[in-house]
Interface confidence: low
């Protein structure tokens, strides 16, 4: 009898243990991706970045996808998601087309119901990067709390892409779930 | 028969309740680290940061350990890091050596294992800080989702240390844990 | 007996998950707050922004208020709060009334026990906004981990509100619970 | 720079109105911090009295809410003191001074006026 | 309301030594508190805040301490021009509070 309740509560408390870390590890899916330099575009219109890194160096993801440039939403929930984005010249790069800049990037999300993409956040700034200085930098930081659908999907978009600075530590976005939705 | 079975049904809740209540607490550390201007260095060459305060105003610290100017990791996990960095001046502290200033912050990873440091994310601006005005701000906001070891360690490097605005709502890095490793 | 003792197992499952499930939502507020550009105040002057959507595209709240222009807390925790602000002028509005410009944030925190505000977060940059040039764009992004109790009031206060971006994706705060205070 | 400079008369006698004036150059009142008063007694002893913050809201020490009252002009960048009822433990020195964003320490300080209640 | 205690209502020292001034808080502050310096015939001037971080341009030989009731602020190689009456203040609560302060004076 009461070894018989014992062994119950044993696999009660197992079987909770082994629920609570599973559904732990199944709620928290996560991705930082860096950017992948090999195939930056180049130019000074805005584009969509297409080449990202997910499993080398700070690069990582699980229970999520990426593809074609995008970070798929594999669990419904609200996640926190996140970029930084690093722009740097330097003149030994050659002259600028124009030193009037405007240095941007717009997180998107991309809804399977609705083929459109909608930005869910941007920053940026206007720069006046003049011959006087040999070198400029400047980075943007943008992040925010969203709702987000299995299939839905996150992509970057920046202006003046041939300015991107390649570094893992520099140019990267990424996204970690919060909590499910109710 | 019934009524120890319903004592053994409370000692699971109640076990589960204290276990659920531990584990969730001692899953999450977190810091949040405000910058110690008493001790901050001079120049405008690059340095570590590593006086911060972790027990007044704003900054706390559970489950992980601030020594020698670095936040240590004692519990594995991926973590949220962020650092905001303040940059000032103004013209009652004197001329600046060189009105182009290069404002950066860098988030550094010491492994154990591997004793050099890594740079997780960086940030900052090129700036020309004309003596035509006669005050000058400028902040950085980086942010990152990150595997941590224990005993791992973070630290903060910036450039143009002297100009930091030494407010704890201005310079400040911290960070918190998401979740366990797989 | 056997049969008795899988009921109550079934019982302390069922319980648990209801339990888990019911904590699990409790314990996470959050807010994602987008600019209600219907009324931004006008000038050059810092402001407190009191009008903020929570229920219209990316604004969303749960277990938290907002309430005469600031996020109320209703559940003590450990928050992690953000804010993203862009100013922005295009020529077509008319000359500022200087080029000179300081575009600040601050994430302010009244307490009810200090009917005072106290600035928990800041970030911004001086500006030289020129006539030559026909647009300026300038983004700001703070983020950080702090200790709320129910009561406390989050707001943002801003410089030159006039210059600010409309669009949800570009002035927004917002906070989400990741612990409980010990 | 900030400056601040306190304005009023030096005598006033019992049971009328003290009114004293703050006068702030290098920033504007409505910018940014709280603006206090604060007094201080013949042996030093300082009271704090009360502030205005930039938005306009106002606190006040619960000891004399009932006889004082801070105000503004924004326009003349200047706040203000309304002090009713002043007996002869009002003689102090009057200071005005500016408080820190995130910290209600004071960073800026006027001279100070002082004032003696006297019949 | 939160009464800030100084003990000493004066202190003597020498140039050179290091002196310790003390404040007690009746109720725990945190670290909600700030010192002043006020020498004869001018207004007090901000010293530290947060209980232990210099205000901009105020000399290292400055240090403050404490937390919760009991603060300390400390003046090492003490100089004549450091004659004055430092006072402490609290600001966890309103109303704002400030210590009876301690003359120091220069043997």
């Known amino acids: 009898g009461s070894q018989h309740i014992r062994a119950e509560k044993a696999m009660v408390d197992g079987s909770w243990l082994d629920l609570a870390k599973r559904s732990k590890l199944e709620a928290q899916p996560f991705a930082h991706l860096t950017i992948n330099a090999t195939d930056i575009p180049s130019g000074s219109h805005k584009v969509s970045l297409s080449s990202w890194y997910h499993d080398r160096g700070w690069a990582k993801i699980s229970n999520m996808t990426f593809s074609n440039g995008k970070l798929i939403v594999n669990q419904d929930g609200f996640y926190y998601l996140y970029a930084n984005i690093c722009f740097r010249h330097h003149e030994t790069s050659g002259d600028l087309a124009t030193e009037y800049l405007q240095l941007m990037v717009y997180v998107t999300k991309t809804s399977i119901k609705i083929p459109s993409s909608h930005t869910l956040m941007k920053g940026g700034s206007t720069k006046y990067w003049s011959g006087n200085s040999e070198f400029h930098f400047y980075s943007i930081n943008v992040g925010g709390f969203f709702k987000l659908r299995s299939g839905e999907e996150i992509s970057i978009e920046v202006s003046n892409p041939s300015l991107l600075d390649p570094d893992q530590d520099a140019t990267y976005f990424g996204a970690f779930k919060v909590r499910d939705i109710d | 028969g019934s009524q120890h079975i319903r004592a053994e049904k409370a000692m699971v809740d109640g076990s589960w309740l204290d276990l659920a209540k531990r584990s969730k607490l001692e899953a999450q550390p977190f810091a949040h680290l405000t910058i110690n201007a008493t001790d901050i260095p001079s120049g405008s060459h690059k340095v570590s940061l590593s006086s911060w305060y972790h027990d007044r105003g704003w900054a706390k610290i559970s489950n992980m350990t601030f020594s020698n100017g670095k936040l240590i990791v004692n519990q594995d996990g991926f973590y949220y890091l962020y650092a905001n960095i303040c940059f000032r001046h103004h013209e009652t502290s004197g001329d600046l050596a060189t009105e182009y200033l290069q404002l950066m912050v860098y988030v550094t990873k010491t492994s154990i294992k591997i004793p050099s440091s890594h740079t997780l994310m960086k940030g900052g601006s090129t700036k020309y800080w004309s003596g035509n005005s006669e005050f000058h701000f400028y902040s950085i906001n980086v942010g990152g989702f990150f595997k941590l070891r224990s005993g791992e360690e973070i630290s903060i490097e910036v450039s143009n240390p002297s100009l930091l605005d030494p407010d704890q709502d201005a310079t400040y890095f911290g960070a918190f844990k998401v979740r366990d490793i797989d | 007996g056997s049969q008795h003792i899988r009921a109550e197992k079934a019982m302390v499952d069922g319980s648990w998950l209801d339990l888990a499930k019911r904590s699990k939502l409790e314990a996470q507020p959050f807010a994602h707050l987008t600019i209600n550009a219907t009324d931004i105040p006008s000038g050059s002057h810092k402001v407190s922004l009191s009008s903020w959507y929570h229920d219209r595209g990316w604004a969303k709240i749960s277990n938290m208020t907002f309430s005469n222009g600031k996020l109320i807390v209703n559940q003590d925790g450990f928050y992690y709060l953000y804010a993203n602000i862009c100013f922005r002028h295009h020529e077509t509005s008319g000359d500022l009334a200087t080029e000179y410009l300081q575009l600040m944030v601050y994430v302010t925190k009244t307490s009810i026990k200090i009917p005072s505000s106290h600035t928990l977060m800041k970030g911004g940059s001086t500006k030289y906004w020129s006539g030559n040039s026909e647009f300026h764009f300038y983004s700001i992004n703070v983020g950080g981990f702090f200790k709320l109790r129910s009561g406390e009031e989050i707001s943002i206060e801003v410089s030159n509100p006039s210059l600010l971006d409309p669009d949800q994706d570009a002035t927004y705060f917002g906070a989400f619970k990741v612990r409980d205070i010990d | 720079d900030v400056q601040l400079q306190e304005s009023g008369p030096d005598l006033v006698k019992p049971s009328q109105s003290l009114s004293l004036t703050c006068t702030v150059t290098g920033y504007s009142i409505s910018s940014g911090y709280s603006w206090h008063w604060i007094r201080q007694f013949p042996g030093n002893k300082l009271e704090w009295m009360d502030y205005i913050h930039f938005s306009g809201s106002t606190n006040y020490n619960p000891s004399l809410k009932s006889r004082i009252s801070i105000t503004r002009d924004t326009s003349k960048n200047q706040f203000f003191l309304q002090f009713i009822s002043v007996t002869t433990e009002d003689t102090a020195t009057y200071y005005c001074a500016r408080s820190g964003p995130s910290t209600y320490v004071m960073d800026y300080w006027g001279q100070g006026t002082s004032v003696t209640v006297s019949s | 309301d939160i009464v800030m205690t100084q003990s000493h209502r004066f202190m003597s020292t020498s140039v050179g030594d290091r002196v310790s001034i003390t404040c007690k808080a009746s109720q725990d502050v945190g670290a909600a508190v700030g010192w002043y310096q006020q020498k004869p015939g001018q207004s007090p001037k901000l010293l530290i805040y947060w209980a232990s971080i210099r205000d901009t341009g105020v000399p290292d030989r400055f240090t403050g301490s404490g937390s919760g009731t009991d603060f300390t602020l400390t003046i090492s190689n003490v100089q004549s021009e450091d004659l004055a009456d430092y006072f402490c203040?609290?600001?966890?609560?309103?109303?704002?509070?400030f210590g009876g302060g301690t003359k120091l004076e220069i043997k």
């Open positions: 203040q609290h600001y966890n609560s309103y109303p704002l509070t």
